[in-house]
């Protein structure tokens, strides 16, 4: 009822502001708003086959507001742009396009990659790692004494994780063989007693070649190593220093 009264009023006064709805300053029954109240933006809205004028406090998606002396109007952003400051600077692209320097592109330029989360072209970020930390002490089963061969490890940190097209990170862990310090273990540092270290018999159905557990591995290695004379030990130590086995953790 109210709507029809409003419509009738507009028909009687086609260009008088009292008969207009919303922020219209002047209007017509057929075209809707013809001009807007101060600070409001004029936009054309398509309804079926005709366009009617509307007055808005801010322009709809895909349009931006421009203030001229005679009219504040909503102007269309470029076809591939969803929101923009003006024709030159898009701030959000339509689906399937990537934002780069205020423009919308279907593919990012050379040297840049598409961020599918922000839908922007971004610089390719390569992995960056710190310098290696010092080697850890040479240990064998957590002990730093005895004449056994052990391992030492060093690590480095990832300072910058790579982006999708960036170079992968190099290994961040490195392990190499070494010879544990030439000092006798103190009483508390000694390993388990010999009989506890004896090789277990394989379970039924278990292959004789099954990898021995670390305890049996230790006992089996101990015997020949203990038999070595001083000369051989020295030789082995030099060889071990030269041999550096890397265990890589790739990110």
């Amino acid at each position: 009822q109210n709507a029809s009264r409003g419509r009738r009023q507009r028909r009687m006064h086609p260009n008088v502001s009292q008969g207009c709805q919303g922020g219209c300053a002047t209007c017509s029954d057929y075209n809707g708003c013809l001009s807007c109240k101060p600070r409001l933006f004029f936009a054309l809205e398509r309804i079926g086959m005709k366009q009617i004028g509307v007055c808005l406090s801010s322009c709809p998606s895909g349009y931006y507001g421009t203030r001229y002396p005679d009219i504040n109007k909503c102007t269309k952003c470029k076809a591939d742009c969803d929101t923009c400051f003006n024709k030159n600077f898009c701030t959000k692209c339509k689906s399937g396009f990537y934002l780069h320097l205020g423009k919308c592109l279907d593919n990012c330029p050379e040297g840049l990659e598409a961020n599918n989360h922000t839908m922007e072209c971004v610089s390719i970020v390569h992995c960056e790692v710190s310098e290696w930390n010092p080697w850890s002490p040479c240990t064998k089963k957590g002990k730093t004494c005895g004449f056994k061969r052990g391992t030492e490890t060093r690590v480095r940190e990832i300072i910058q994780h790579p982006s999708a097209k960036g170079n992968l990170c190099p290994p961040t862990n490195e392990t190499r063989k070494c010879t544990v310090q030439r000092k006798k273990c103190q009483k508390g540092e000694r390993g388990k007693k010999g009989r506890e270290r004896k090789r277990k018999k394989p379970n039924k159905g278990e292959s004789k070649e099954a990898i021995p557990d670390s305890k049996s591995l230790e006992s089996s290695k101990e015997i020949p190593e203990q038999r070595e004379n001083k000369q051989q030990q020295k030789k082995r130590k030099v060889q071990d220093k030269q041999k550096s086995v890397s265990v890589s953790t790739v990110h």
Epitope: Y64, T66, R67, Y68, P69, D70, F85, N86, K87, N88, F89
Partner: antibody, heavy 116, light 107 residues
């Protein structure tokens, strides 16, 4: 790459006329509102006139209304400023620029000196 | 017409300094404010629009703030290439007007 190149500046006597041109390239000229902005020697920037993309509406600062006319030829990608009845206070570097709220792209400017 | 008043008119600073330039409007211009940089003999270059939106390619040491009538341009750590004249501009109302400029010089 957007390029705006002004020409037509020079030394002219008060009361005489001058026509400035601005050749545009690297963008769709007919999509953009264009403007002239001037800068007197050692002074600030002053908007002079704007013409909307299709040439149907023009706007001027009060001090040049009735003396200056801004126009464009979209088929030639060229903007013009016809300056009549020139005064000493019109002496400035005249820049053409795209005008879409802000002045995003500028030419290198052309110097106009009004002196007897 | 809306008047824009910049302060200071000129400013001496050193590389690495933090610098602030202010722009005051004679009436409310909401967030319709831009900043330009101009080097001697060159045309102005747009840096910031809508008070604080940086143009692509402008270093992040430049930032803008404010609303209504009071606005600031801040350069967090001056670089040699930043010594220039800076202008504010309002586009809330015709005629679009500029501040008188702030000349940033090397101390």
């Amino acid at each position: 790459e957007v390029q705006l190149v002004e020409s037509g500046g020079g030394v002219v006597q008060p009361g005489r006329s001058l026509r400035l041109s601005c050749a545009a390239s690297g963008f769709t000229f007919s999509d953009y509102d264009m403007a002239w902005v001037r800068q007197a020697p050692g002074k600030g920037l002053e908007w002079v006139a704007t013409i909307i993309y299709d040439g149907s509406r023009t706007y001027y600062r009060d001090s040049v209304k009735g003396r200056f006319t801004i126009s464009r030829d979209n088929s030639k990608n060229t903007l013009y400023l016809q300056m009549n009845s020139l005064r000493a206070e019109d002496t400035a570097v005249y820049y053409c620029a795209t005008h879409d709220k802000t002045f995003d792209y500028w030419g290198q400017g052309t110097m106009v000196t009004v002196s007897s | 017409d809306i008047q824009l008043t910049q302060s200071p008119s000129s400013l001496s600073a050193s590389v690495g300094d933090r610098v602030t330039i202010t722009c005051r409007a004679s009436e409310d211009i909401y967030s319709d404010l831009a900043w330009y940089q101009q080097k001697p003999g060159k045309s102005p270059k747009l840096l910031i629009y809508d008070v604080n939106s940086l143009i692509h390619g402008v270093p992040s040491r430049f930032s803008g703030s404010g609303s209504g009538t009071d606005f600031t341009l801040t350069i967090s750590s001056l670089q040699p290439e930043d010594f220039a004249t800076y202008f504010c501009q309002q586009y809330d109302n015709y005629p679009n007007t500029f501040g008188q400029g702030t000349k940033l010089e090397i101390k």
